[in-house]
Each structure stands twice: as structure tokens, then as C-alpha cells.
């Protein structure tokens, strides 16, 4: 039975040209995290394999930085980056957990930043 839950940063906004940390945290399970995939709709941004480290999709390699932790830092944001992002936790023996983050990239320089997510 899958008992875990994914906590995410939820809905966040950031300024065009700035950067943002996408962060998820899996809790309430003792399952072993084998891999975390970061995806946007039908696109793969990055994979963090617990043993093999990071794979960054070439289309994002100049704008994505691994971390902190299992999170992902998106840089040089454009309005086209607005949309849904998914963290997909592959775990053993539970299976797959998915978290959702909605990012809005604003033209305005007075964009409200969502509270930075801290893993305890």
C-alpha cells in the first residue's frame, strides 16, 4: 500500500530573466527513492538517479542546474516557462509518486515569489 505523500512548493511565480527552485519532498513512507524525474507536460527536464546522479535534457542544459538536493533550479526564465512541472518519485517498493508545481513567469519586476521551500 502506498502511504507516502508529496509536498511541493505549489503555485509559484517568478520574474522573467530570474531563477526559481522547483522542490518536492516525499514523506510518510519508508520506501527507498531510486529516481526522481522532473518533467514539464510531455518534456523531460532532468532525472536524478540515486546511484548514477543527474541526467539533464540537452534542450534545458543551459538553463537548468541540478539541486539543491533532489530539486531543480530553473534559470533565465522566460514567459514560455509558465506552466505545470511534475516531480515523479520512483520508489521501491511503493512505486511512483507524482507532485505538481505550477510556475507563472511574470513580465513585471514586482513578481511575488512563492515562499522558498525548505526540506527539514
Amino acid at each position: 500500500m502506498m502511504t507516502g505523500t508529496i509536498e511541493t512548493t505549489g503555485n509559484i511565480s517568478a520574474e522573467k530573466g530570474g531563477s526559481i527552485i522547483l522542490q518536492c519532498h516525499l514523506s510518510s513512507t519508508t520506501a527507498q527513492v531510486t529516481q526522481v524525474n522532473w518533467e514539464q507536460q510531455d518534456q523531460l527536464l532532468a532525472i536524478c538517479n540515486a546511484d548514477l546522479g543527474w541526467h539533464i535534457s540537452p534542450s534545458f542544459k543551459d538553463r537548468v542546474a541540478p539541486g539543491p538536493g533532489l530539486g531543480l533550479t530553473l534559470q533565465s526564465l522566460t514567459v514560455n516557462d509558465t506552466g505545470e512541472y511534475f516531480c515523479i518519485y520512483h520508489t521501491y517498493p511503493d512505486g511512483t509518486y507524482t507532485g505538481r508545481i505550477f510556475l507563472e513567469v511574470l513580465e513585471s519586476s514586482v513578481a511575488e515569489h512563492g515562499a522558498r521551500f525548505q526540506i527539514p
Epitope: 548514477l52 546522479g53 539533464i56
Partner: antibody
Framework: EVQLVQSGAEVKKPGASVKISCKTS????????MHWVRQAPGKGLEWIGG????????SYNQKFKGRATLTVDKSTSTAYMELSSLRSEDTAVYYC????????????WGQGTLVTVSS | DIQLTQSPSSLSASVGDRVTITCKAS??????VAWYQQKPGKAPKLLIY???YRNTGVPSRFSGSGSGTDFTFTISSLQPEDFATYYC?????????FGQGTKLEIK
């Protein structure tokens, strides 16, 4: 120039073990994952596992877990793959292959080591 | 494990022909697919990574496309040195798996 040079062909008896080396040069060894792939005669490619030298992280294909052991010697920039309890079906060419930078595909390959298991 | 099915398994073609090989994954792998060329007695050589990116030094006649479960590898105009076996590989999740290969032969 990136190079991966593997040890020579081996003939082993069933039940024995074999240890293949893969000496690398031309790049910073600890920054790239090393994969091991095998190919039985006339057959396709099969991923055995991969190792990240900087932190020692190892991912094994479950099929080989318990029989395959991946190690590295950072001082000589050499990767090793040991396979134990050999059987005839393990007769194959074994390749080491470097994972591309921040990617899981393999951009440089060793020349291969033929392991023959025969009684 | 994710299964990759290549088609056709073998293919006869002539120099100058346009050749297409397909690779179907048993589940969504996004764009985490690579294509390799292997000649007899030699190690595989990376041609395409992340579904559509040509590796350094690979001629422009080689291309790849696709996303999700369906991928295509194309040689726009076959050259004599292109006769070999081609493999797709997924690196979306471990164990990384390969297709069974497509042997490209001279007609």
C-alpha cells in the same frame, strides 16, 4: 583524446569468476559515469550496470545483482567489472562505456573483452 | 523493465536510399532515447542522444525524432559505410534497455 582500453580475452570454466579492467585516459575520470554492457555472440546489447566514480554510487541491472561487482580505482582511472558463478550463457563480449557529461547515454566505448565460458 | 521493440529486424537497401527504423517503448520514456551504430567486431558508436540530438562528429544524414513511446531513426541518403546494425536504447529508468537491433544490409 578520450580512450577506454580493456583487458584481454578470457577463457573460464563454469562456476569461476572473471574480472575485466577498463583503463581510461583523456578526461577527468571521476566526473563521468561508467557503464558496463555485454553482447552474446550474434545477439543484442544488454546493460549490466553503471557506476559513478565520484561518490561510488552503483546501479545494477537486477538480472546481474549478486553476480556482478563494479568497482573503480580512482588513482589509476580504471574501472573493473567482476562476474562470478559463470555459466555458458555468460559467454559474450563485455564493454565498458563512458556516460556522457550529465547524461546517461554512452559516448565513448572500450574495444570490448571476449569472455568464453566453457568446460 | 521497459521493453524496446525495433522494426524492422533487418533491412536491405541501396546506396542513396532513405532508410527509416522505428523503436517502440513499452511505456512513456519522454525523449530519453539514444541510437547506436555497430559494425561487426567493433564497439557500438553513439549517433543520436535524447531522441533527436546528433552526437559530435556524426554526419547530418543521420537524424532522430519522437517522444513518449514512438521513436524514429532516419538515414537520409545511405552511404557504403552505413551498412551496420543499429540499436535504440532507453535511459529513462534503470535497468537501461536496448532494442533487439536492426541489421542494415546491402541490396
Amino acid at each position: 583524446e578520450v580512450q577506454l582500453v580493456q583487458s584481454g580475452a578470457e577463457v573460464k570454466k563454469p562456476g569461476a569468476s572473471v574480472k575485466i579492467s577498463c583503463k581510461t585516459s583523456g578526461y577527468t575520470f571521476t566526473e563521468f559515469t561508467m557503464h558496463w554492457v555485454r553482447q552474446a555472440p550474434g545477439k543484442g546489447l544488454e546493460w549490466i550496470g553503471g557506476l559513478k566514480p565520484d561518490n561510488g554510487g552503483i546501479s545494477y541491472n537486477q538480472k546481474f545483482k549478486g553476480r556482478a561487482t563494479l568497482t573503480v580505482d580512482k588513482s589509476t582511472s580504471t574501472a573493473y567489472m567482476e562476474l562470478s558463478s559463470l555459466r555458458s550463457e555468460d559467454t559474450a563480449v563485455y564493454y565498458c562505456a563512458r556516460g556522457a557529461y550529465y547524461r546517461y547515454d554512452a559516448d565513448y566505448w572500450g574495444q570490448g573483452t571476449l569472455v568464453t565460458v566453457s568446460s | 523493465d521497459i521493453q524496446l521493440t525495433q522494426s524492422p529486424s533487418s533491412l536491405s537497401a541501396s546506396v542513396g536510399d532513405r532508410v527509416t527504423i522505428t523503436c517502440k517503448a513499452s511505456q512513456d520514456v519522454k525523449t530519453a532515447v539514444a541510437w547506436y551504430q555497430q559494425k561487426p567486431g567493433k564497439a557500438p558508436k553513439l549517433l543520436i542522444y535524447s531522441a533527436s540530438y546528433r552526437n559530435t562528429g556524426v554526419p547530418s544524414r543521420f537524424s532522430g525524432s519522437g517522444s513518449g513511446t514512438d521513436f524514429t531513426f532516419t538515414i537520409s541518403s545511405l552511404q557504403p559505410e552505413d551498412f551496420a546494425t543499429y540499436y535504440c536504447q532507453q535511459h529513462y529508468s534503470t535497468p537501461f534497455t536496448f532494442g533487439q537491433g536492426t541489421k542494415l544490409e546491402i541490396k
